[in-house]
Every structure is written in C-alpha cells, then in structure tokens.
Amino acid sequence: MSSKYPRSVRRCLPLWALTLEAALILLFYFFTHYDASLEDQKGLVASYQVGQDLTVMAAIGLGFLTSSFRRHSWSSVAFNLFMLALGVQWAILLDGFLSQFPSGKVVITLFSIRLATMSALSVLISVDAVLGKVNLAQLVVMVLVEVTALGNLRMVISNIFNTDYHMNMMHIYVFAAYFGLSVAWCLPKPLPEGTEDKDQTATIPSLSAMLGALFLWMFWPSFNSALLRSPIERKNAVFNTYYAVAVSVVTAISGSSLAHPQGKISKTYVHSAVLAGGVAVGTSCHLIPSPWLAMVLGLVAGLISVGGAKYLPGCCNRVLGIPHSSIMGYNFSLLGLLGEIIYIVLLVLDTVGAGNGMIGFQVLLSIGELSLAIVIALMSGLLTGLLLNLKIWKAPHEAKYFDDQVFWKFPHLAVGF
C-alpha cells in the first residue's frame, strides 16, 4: 500500500494552494497587462535567453542541488519546482505593486519576469535548510513570506539608499541564507532514533546534486550580470564571474582533498564550493577591472567554502538541526558576507584614494544596507518559523523527516505509513 499524506493535510494542501492560485489569477486579471511596446524579435530573444538561464538555474540547478538525501530526492526536486512556480507569480505581482502601482496597472515585461525569477531563487536557497522537515502547505507560507520580505527589502534599499537593481538584488545571497537559517532554528530539531540514515546522502541522488551544481556553475555568469545596466557592465560581470567560479572549482576539489585525513574528496564540499566564486564576486562582479582579482576572490571563496563545510556542519546540526549535507545556508551566509565585504573594501579604497568624506559616507550607507538585509532576513525568517510551527499546517512528524514516502505515491513499494 502506498503512503499517504495525513488526512488533514490532504484536505489542507489542495484547498490552500488552489485558493491561493485562484487569488493570484484574480489579481493578474484585475491589475496586470503585458508590455505592448514595440520590440524587435532579435532583442526579444536575447532578453528572453537571460530569463531562461535564470529559470534553468532555479528549476534544474537548485532543484537538483538539494536532492542529495537518500530518501528525499523526489521531494527536493519537485517541491523546488512548486516553490519556483508559485514564487515567480507572487514576485511579479509584488514587484509591480511596489514599483509601478501608482500608475494603475502592473506592466509585465521580460525584465519583470527576470526579476521575479531571481526573487523566487531566494526561497530556493533558503529552503535548503528546512527541506525534509516541512510539507508543501508550510512551503507555500514560506514562499509568500520570503518573497514579500525580499521585495520590501529591495524597495526600501532602492528608495533609501538609492541603489540600482543589481546592487539591491545582490543582497539575495545574505538575505536568503539568514532567512533559511532562522526558519530552521524555529523548527523541531532533534532527529529521533532510527531516522539518522534518512538525512545521509546516497550515490545516485548525490550524482543528481552534482548535476545541479554543474547547471548552476554554467549559468552563474548570467545570474550575476542579469540586472546590469549596459553591455560593457554585463560583459565585465560575465568575465569576472566565469574566472571566479573556474578558480573556485579547482580550489574546492583540491581543498576538499586537503581537508580529508586520507586525501579523499567530499561530494558535499564540492557540490557547494564550486559555486563559491560566483557568490563572492556577485556584488562587485562588474567593478573588478582584471581577471587576476576575480581569480583571487574565487580562490579565497573556495577556501572559505571548504573550511566552512568542514567545521560548520557540526555546529549547524546541533544548534539549527540542519543536516550535514544541507550546506547551502551557511555556505551562502559566509560567501554572501564575503561578497558584501569585498564591495565595502572597494569603497574604502576609494575613500583612501580620494580623501573624500562623501565616499566615506557611501561606505556607511553600504554597511547600513547589509545590516538592514540581515536584520529583515532574521526577523522575517523567525516570523516564518513561528508560522510554520502552527498546528494547522500538520507538519510531518519528526519520525517522518526526510522521507519521500510521506509525500509521494510509489506503487512498487509495499511500505505503509
């Protein structure tokens, strides 16, 4: 007999998700329309390709990257797709309401879809810390709260600090990481006896996680350059991101071997560390003037990522209940901070060079932006964590953490729950 959702969740999830979808359809009906302006086919295709790259990163890259659990790989991939689909819809509406609504209608362009996909990516990064411990109904709540918090953060930063799309979206790494970690902190932590094996990685899911990492690795330059203003900025961002991720791969594999007593390479380290350079150069990818600097940053990021993967999981497992293989949260929190610090260092160097007090003020503004991103991430993450703990969501029992059979129909299995 195939396993089923608990009866209450069977009632709750479809009703909750479909009611929400109906509400979104109504909002789209009343408040949105497509951009009707003329655009040539060539420009349209070029603009769409960037959005496509981002969707591949989100659906395949992050979907498979989180699928390394022995008995939770189906749920990881499919739940990621579910969250992406829902997140993009809500993000398009929210961004439109926050930035365009005074003009009456939200105009949907390819650029707004690009922005929405990047906002939804934030949830996919955060959810790595809680996947396996929550059901789809809870994930819907997480998507809504996180996309709303990120949208508001971006609007506040844009209005108060006068930063452009690229700069305020690059807080996504830090925001997503701290949001996810604070949600995880609120959820029930101890894994009961007999379920430890479920959060272990298995060979085939680990291979699919590596596939996810490869997709992310290939498309990270598109992510870092997607919101930049001009071809010269975008070109520089693509080059620098490519050099940084290339070096972080070499560093990740060799550093992983170095960190092991027998010189063996850890799959878990490599899955995450290959992306380290892309995250670290994110904020300043268009500002770095030469390849060697991007490569140095990729090297440093790779080392930090491997070091973090070696020493932080024990702490994260104890304090936050995050399994050893879910390393995206603390990895992105470290590397996102590194990226922000690199940008602040560039501003400090400007201040030293120019002896200009106003540039010093820019440094303070950047520190303020970063602090605001962390504070909003922690507060909204804690709020989400508290909401997810409510009984109405019928969260999976701790004994059924990290188990596909709680959520999926496997006709060939005769195991009942």
Epitope: S47, L110, R229, S230, P231, I288, L346, I359
Partner: antibody, heavy 129, light 108 residues
Framework: QVQLVETGGGVVQPGRSLRLSCAAS????????MHWVRQAPGKGLEWVAV????????YYADSVKGRFTISRDNSRNTLYLQMNSLRAEDTAVFYC??????????????????????WGQGTTVTVSS | DIQMTQSPSSLSASVGDRVTITCRAS??????LNWYQQKPGKAPNLLIF???TLQSGVPSRFSGSGSGTDFTLTISSLQPEDFATYYC??????????FGQGTKLEIK
C-alpha cells in the same frame, strides 16, 4: 555620420495622445541606451525617460509616469515615445539623445560613466485647446 | 530623488574673462556629473562627462572639476561662441537623470 531625427510633433488637444519617433543612423542602435529629454518654452532641460539598450528596462520622470511610454525597435533603429493624456504643461521641444557608456579603471575597480553624447534636433509638441 | 542646483542662474562676462559655474547635488554622486552647452534654438551639446573628462572636439579652455556634491565648470578665456546656457546633469542614479536649472552666460 551619427544622426538622430525626431518626428511626430504637432498641435494636440489636452487629454489626447501623440507618438513621437526618433530615427537613428550611423551607429549600432541596439548597443546604446536612449533617452527622451524635453524643454518647455523659455525653460531648462527636463529629462523624460530612458530605455536600456536591449529594451529590458525603462525609467520615467515622475511628471510623466503612467502617461508616457518609451519603447524601441532595434530592427528598425527607431526609438518611440507614446504620450497619452497630454496636458498643457507637456508643451515643449522633445529631444531624443543617445546614452554613451564609458569607464575608467584603477588597479582595484572600474568606474562606469554615462552621458548623452548625441542629440537630435528636436520636435515641437504643443498641447492646446 | 537627487536634486541639482546651479549657481549663478545667469552671469554676464566679457570675452577673455575666466568664468566659473558651480553645480551642487543634494547627495553624493561621486564623479557622475556631465556638463552640456545649449545655444538658442539648438539641441544641447556635451562638453564634459564624468565631472572632468573633456568630450572630443570640445576646446581645451573648458574644464570641469569636483566630486561628491560640489562641481565646477570653468571657461579659462571666454570666446564669443561660448555665450550660451550651460546645464549640469547627474547620471549617478540609473533610474532618474536630473538636470540643473541652467546658467545663462551673457555678454556684458
């Protein structure tokens, strides 16, 4: 040579619509951001709108937001400004301008600069009843 | 939004004079400031970008300086063809490009 030519101006009643065009020649149009700037009679320059090189992003001055739409057709090397719900205060000479981007570098970072280096001759829009 | 304030709003000078026009931003714009010259009935013409870089073809008597919030345009030796209106413009914010109100330079 590099040239921008605006057309579509004229006399229009308040509340009506008008579409301005700007034909570009002598450069790779799809590689440049483009602006509309206007100048009311006897007044200074007022920036109206900008569109990015690939058409992915558009920004407007508060005074025209929700009424004017900037667009471009890179295959036709043409920039457009659709003006709806026109008011008397929209009476002005409208210029299209090319945005040039450049950068300078120190050893540790790049500095990007943007400026309007090529302007059209302007087209006059008069909103009057 | 960033506001740009030019001073003086009008200025009388003679050929050969050294003239300085100032532009102040309501917040730091680093070096993202451009200067334009406009003659009556004509389109504006770019003089200086990035606060101090002279556009090609512009005479070397024009120079720009400043960073942060305070900027100046200097004409070292005024020529008859320099009598026009001058505008500063910030490009720090990629979403709103603001011009100063203009400085009209007239013959004394």
């Amino acid at each position: 040579q590099v040239q921008l030519v605006e057309t579509g101006g004229g006399v229009v009643q308040p509340g009506r619509s008008l579409r301005l065009s700007c034909a570009a020649s002598g450069f790779t149009f799809s590689s440049y951001g483009m602006h509309w700037v206007r100048q009311a009679p006897g007044k200074g320059l007022e920036w109206v709108a900008v569109i990015w090189s690939d058409g992915s992003n558009k920004y407007y001055a508060d005074s025209v937001k929700g009424r004017f739409t900037i667009s471009r057709d890179n295959s036709r090397n043409t920039l457009y400004l659709q003006m709806n719900s026109l008011r008397a205060e929209d009476t002005a000479v409208f210029y299209c301008a090319r945005e040039q981007g450049g950068y300078s570098s120190s050893w540790y970072r790049r500095y990007y600069y943007y400026y309007m280096d090529v302007w059209g001759q302007g087209t006059t829009v008069t909103v009057s009843s | 939004d960033i506001q740009m304030t030019q001073s003086p709003s009008s200025l009388s000078a003679s050929v050969g004079d050294r003239v300085t026009i100032t532009c102040r931003a309501s917040q730091s714009i680093s070096s993202w400031l451009n200067w334009y010259q406009q003659k009556p009935g004509k389109a504006p013409n770019l003089l200086i970008f990035a606060a101090s870089t002279l556009q090609s073809g512009v005479p070397s008597r024009f120079s720009g300086s400043g960073s942060g919030t305070d900027f100046t345009l200097t004409i070292s030796s005024l020529q008859p063809e320099d009598f026009a209106t001058y505008y500063c413009q910030q490009s720090y914010s990629s979403s709103v490009y603001t011009f100063g109100q203009g400085t009209k330079l007239e013959i004394k």
